[in-house]
């Protein structure tokens, strides 16, 4: 009888499979920054190294009674979830524990920083195989803790963090808000967000995916073969750390970007009831529950993309929002979204050698989001072509004029503030394949890429009747790289990608007064990578 | 994801009144002071002094020593608890909040963050 959480994240064909690196040499090591742990527990005995690292604050209260089994409870359970013989995700994985949380489960940002530095030092002194760092803790937003995570991630370490148990936006907490960290929210046996008393799992754009985190069976520090169930985003993060350890033991050269993209791509989609989250967070929160992905050898050279939302721009007239991809990823398209519909569009620009997705608020707008589509495109060479706004009444066309470059995304940015004087932009796939077409007062940006075997096509879907949103999906084998809304005269809120679905949103008040002749169109650019083929545009 | 969220950033770029020292007066603080937005989670009295990314090993130690020296001139004892070399340049210090203005004016300082609690999740 396998615990529900393991059944959920490990597909049947993986259950008995042992993960071995091809040459058997590179041993994955997981570092756990948590409470002290009971190393003699049968679940983890022989596979855990309790380091001498200890950086914790004093326990509160004069009458606090230090009881070993209570002090070890949180850490022991998580160590068991990661690598326990029976109830572990990555059975047998080597684990190193660092004590950064006291017997009450409290630590400090400084203690955590010193712990992360200890890992970096260990890595420098004795370089080993792939390293995974599990951070089952959260504090308020900390610039330095996020920066330390970024520095460690850039040395090749994979960091996995709890989203937090505050039923709040994970971006307000650290290390959950660090982009270089894989941030994990918690779901229950019904794949619903975990409620913990009056609180529950954190959510929002800083969460990468969810994993089992309610009533999770794991090692109990009460005795050396005892088990207990615990709940929280720590348990969820431990599942993902275990999955990552298994992925790395099969394929030690996988990078953070590849790991994250594969976790997202192979997760279970659309099973979470998003109504649990606050309305303004629903569109930003990923509807993804982690599962162990197959190896890259089994899945071939798929084009993998993910959607990255910016922080909200704020309501000021010139407020901009910026969304960034990870250093290894290519920004293949940029779109924008505003709840009020008052936005001046989006564009791609280079900042410090990296292309970023920007969106601009409009006068009277409540603010915008920039929405980047970030993809792994091996040996890609991408560039942006833009055309300034045309004179009134004229269309602006931009296409990819370099040989073997294909269009992966379009962005449109309006110079004028007045929303009523301009028609919205449009993609025209039938008459002008592979072109971005903008209408009056719009600067048009085309994202053009060359990569071996990359081919793309436009897919459109329009709805004439009243509808809050129009969607178009890329078919199996194709990956959504660009998503735009092509409306009639009505006001649109913008467009964004959800997995392989392009969602175009229309203003509520615009629904009723639209005539059937003014279709709102969702236009998707769908691409695939066929390494043997030449780059091409498919009509 | 890395934009500063619900976070307190305070500019403490106050010119030093009691400092007659040339090098101190010459350096106007552009560094910022940051602390946790949740008051109950703050640990006043302990600060992480973060230096510019290119700061060399020796300069980190010199900056920490300089802060101790200048604090001593004002009759304050400060304790350097840890020096960060490997992940980022900086140091952890136990000191009175009265010294933040002084610390922010030190060369190489990018920002100072007040220590705060983290919790098991």
């Amino acid at each position: 009888s396998i615990p529900w959480n393991l059944e959920r994240i490990i597909p049947a064909w993986h259950q008995t499979e042992e993960d071995r690196s091809p040459d058997g040499s590179s041993q994955v090591e997981v570092y756990l920054l948590d409470t002290s742990i009971q190393g003699a527990h049968r679940e983890i005995e022989g596979r855990v190294t309790i380091t001498d690292f200890n950086s914790v604050p004093e326990e509160d209260g004069t009458r606090f009674h230090r009881q070993a089994s209570k002090c070890d409870s949180h850490g022991t359970h998580l160590a068991g979830v990661v690598s326990g013989r029976d109830a572990g995700v990555a059975k047998g994985t080597s684990l190193h524990s660092l004590r950064v949380l006291n017997c009450q489960g409290k630590g400090t940002v400084s203690g955590t920083l010193i712990g992360l530095e200890f890992i970096r030092k260990s890595q420098l002194i004795q370089p080993s195989g792939p390293l995974v760092v599990l951070l089952p803790l959260a504090g308020g937003y900390s610039r330095i803790l996020n920066a330390a995570c970024r520095h460690l991630a850039r040395t090749g370490v994979v960091l996995v963090a709890a989203a937090g148990n505050f039923r709040d936006d994970a971006c307000l907490y650290s290390p959950a808000s660090a982009p270089e960290v894989i941030t994990v929210g918690a779901t229950n046996a019904q794949d619903q967000p975990v409620t913990l008393g009056t609180l529950g799992t954190n959510f929002g754009r800083c969460v990468d995916l969810f994993a089992p985190g309610k009533d999770i069976i794991g090692a109990s520090s009460d005795c050396s073969t005892c088990f207990m169930s615990q709940s929280g985003t720590s348990q969820a993060a431990a599942h993902v750390a275990g999955i990552v350890a298994r992925m790395l033991s099969r394929e030690p050269t996988l990078t953070l970007a590849e790991l994250r993209q594969r976790l997202i791509h192979f997760s279970t989609k659309d099973v979470i009831n998003m109504a649990w989250f606050p309305e303004d967070q629903q569109v930003l929160t990923p509807n993804l529950v982690a599962t162990l992905p197959p190896s890259t050898h089994e899945t071939g050279g798929q084009l993998l993309c993910r959607t990255v939302w910016s922080a909200h721009s704020g309501p000021t007239r010139t407020a901009t929002a910026t969304a960034r991809c990870a250093p290894e990823e290519e920004l293949l398209s940029c779109s924008s979204f505003s709840r009020s519909g008052r936005r001046r569009g989006d564009w791609i620009e280079a900042i410090g050698g990296q292309q970023v997705c920007k969106a601009l608020n409009a006068f009277g707008g409540e603010g915008v989001y920039a929405v980047a589509r970030c993809c792994l495109v091996p040996r890609a060479n991408c560039s942006i072509h833009n055309t300034p706004a045309a004179r009134a009444g004229l269309e602006t066309h931009v296409h990819c004029h370099q040989k073997d470059h294909v269009l992966t995304g379009c962005s449109f940015h309006w110079e004028v503030e007045d929303l009523s004087v301009r028609r919205q932009p449009a993609l025209r796939s039938r008459r002008q394949p592979g072109q971005c077409v903008g209408h009056q007062a719009a600067s048009v940006y085309a994202s053009c890429c060359h990569a071996p075997g990359l081919e793309c096509k436009i897919k459109e879907h329009g709805i004439s009747g009243p509808s809050e949103q129009v969607t178009v999906a890329c078919e199996a084998g194709w990956t959504l790289t660009g998503c735009n809304v092509l409306p009639g005269a009505s006001l649109t809120l913008g467009a964004y990608s959800v997995d392989n679905l392009c969602v175009a949103r229309v203003h509520d008040t615009a629904r009723a007064d639209r005539t059937s002749g003014e279709a709102t169109v969702a236009a998707a650019i769908c691409c695939r990578s066929r390494p043997s083929a030449k780059a091409s545009w498919v009509q | 994801q890395d934009e500063d969220g619900d976070y307190e950033e305070l500019m403490l770029a106050l010119p030093s009144q009691e400092d007659g020292l040339a090098d101190e007066a010459a350096h106007v603080a552009t560094a910022t002071f940051r602390r946790c937005s949740k008051e109950a989670w703050r640990l006043p009295g302990t600060y992480i002094v973060v230096l510019m990314e290119e700061t060399q090993r020796l300069q980190i130690e010199q900056t920490a020593h300089r802060l101790q020296t200048r604090a001593a001139r004002r009759g304050y004892v400060i304790k350097v608890l840890h020096i960060f070399y490997d992940l980022f340049p900086g140091f952890l210090v136990k000191m009175s909040s009265d010294l933040l203005g002084l610390a922010l004016k030190l060369p190489h300082v990018e920002y100072i963050e007040e220590d705060s609690f983290v919790f098991a999740q």
């Epitope: 003699a40 527990h41 109830a87 005795c223 | -």
Partner: antibody
Framework: QVQLLESGGGLVQPGGSLRLSCKAS????????IYWVRQAPGKGLEWIGW????????RYNQKFQSKATISRDNSKNTLYLQMNSLRAEDTAVYYC???????????WGQGTLVTVSS | EIVLTQSPATLSLSPGERATITCRAS??????LNWYQQKPGQAPRLLIY???NRATGIPARFSGSGSGTDFTLTISSLEPEDFAVYYC??????????FGGGTKVEIK
């Protein structure tokens, strides 16, 4: 080879007490905990308590907390079970067995019968 | 506290037949369950440790399986000396040592 030999059983008056011994041989005495288990006639096995000879630490089944005391003499490689305030329902075969905590009880003594009767 | 429920309480079989005894734990115990055999007038003897591993000197006809909460002890072909009482055992926090109620395998 590993051996555990119990002694000290016999007939005891109700309210009386007795001390059982368990002599260990054939292994490193301090490396394994020793468990005392009893079995009433025709009944199942019931754990009384254990001792870690290495540090002398003991743990008891709550039911026996005030009745039993476990001790050891490392110089003799011997463990003891002291039972007080005995009643008729304490009539049973008493076994000592060795184990590392969380592992199986891999070696057992032959048992010693304690009869509480007037 | 974990409760171990053994079934059946008594099993009446003939030599050469297959015996199957089950032990159900009230909570998840992983694979940390042991089986013992006790013949009349003798001390218990370890048969199977950690759910499926045969102890030293135990014949191959004895096998254990299961994990989590449901466990099985199987004797593939009963020999005359196998007629005895069988106990399952796990560890817990309080009390730390828990035994099942026992299953008596008797000659039919």
């Amino acid at each position: 080879q590993v051996q555990l030999l119990e002694s000290g059983g016999g007939l005891v008056q109700p309210g009386g007490s007795l001390r059982l011994s368990c002599k260990a041989s054939g292994y490193t005495f301090s490396s394994y905990s020793i468990y005392w288990v009893r079995q009433a006639p025709g009944k199942g096995l019931e754990w009384i308590g254990w001792i870690d000879p290495g540090n002398g630490g003991t743990r008891y089944n709550q039911k026996f907390q005030s009745k039993a005391t476990i001790s050891r003499d490392n110089s003799k490689n011997t463990l003891y079970l002291q039972m007080n305030s005995l009643r008729a329902e304490d009539t049973a075969v008493y076994y000592c067995a060795r184990a590392r905590v969380g592992y199986s009880l891999d070696y057992w003594g032959q048992g010693t019968l304690v009869t509480v009767s007037s | 506290e974990i409760v171990l429920t053994q079934s059946p309480a008594t099993l009446s079989l003939s030599p050469g037949e297959r015996a199957t005894i089950t032990c159900r734990a009230s909570q998840y115990v992983g694979s940390y369950l042991n089986w013992y055999q006790q013949k009349p007038g003798q001390a218990p003897r370890l048969l199977i440790y950690d759910a499926s591993n045969r102890a030293t000197g135990i014949p191959a006809r004895f096998s254990g399986s299961g994990s989590g909460t449901d466990f099985t002890l199987t004797i593939s072909s009963l020999e005359p000396e196998d007629f005895a009482v069988y106990y399952c055992q796990v560890w817990d926090s309080s009390p730390p040592v828990v035994f099942g109620g026992g299953t008596k395998v008797e000659i039919k």
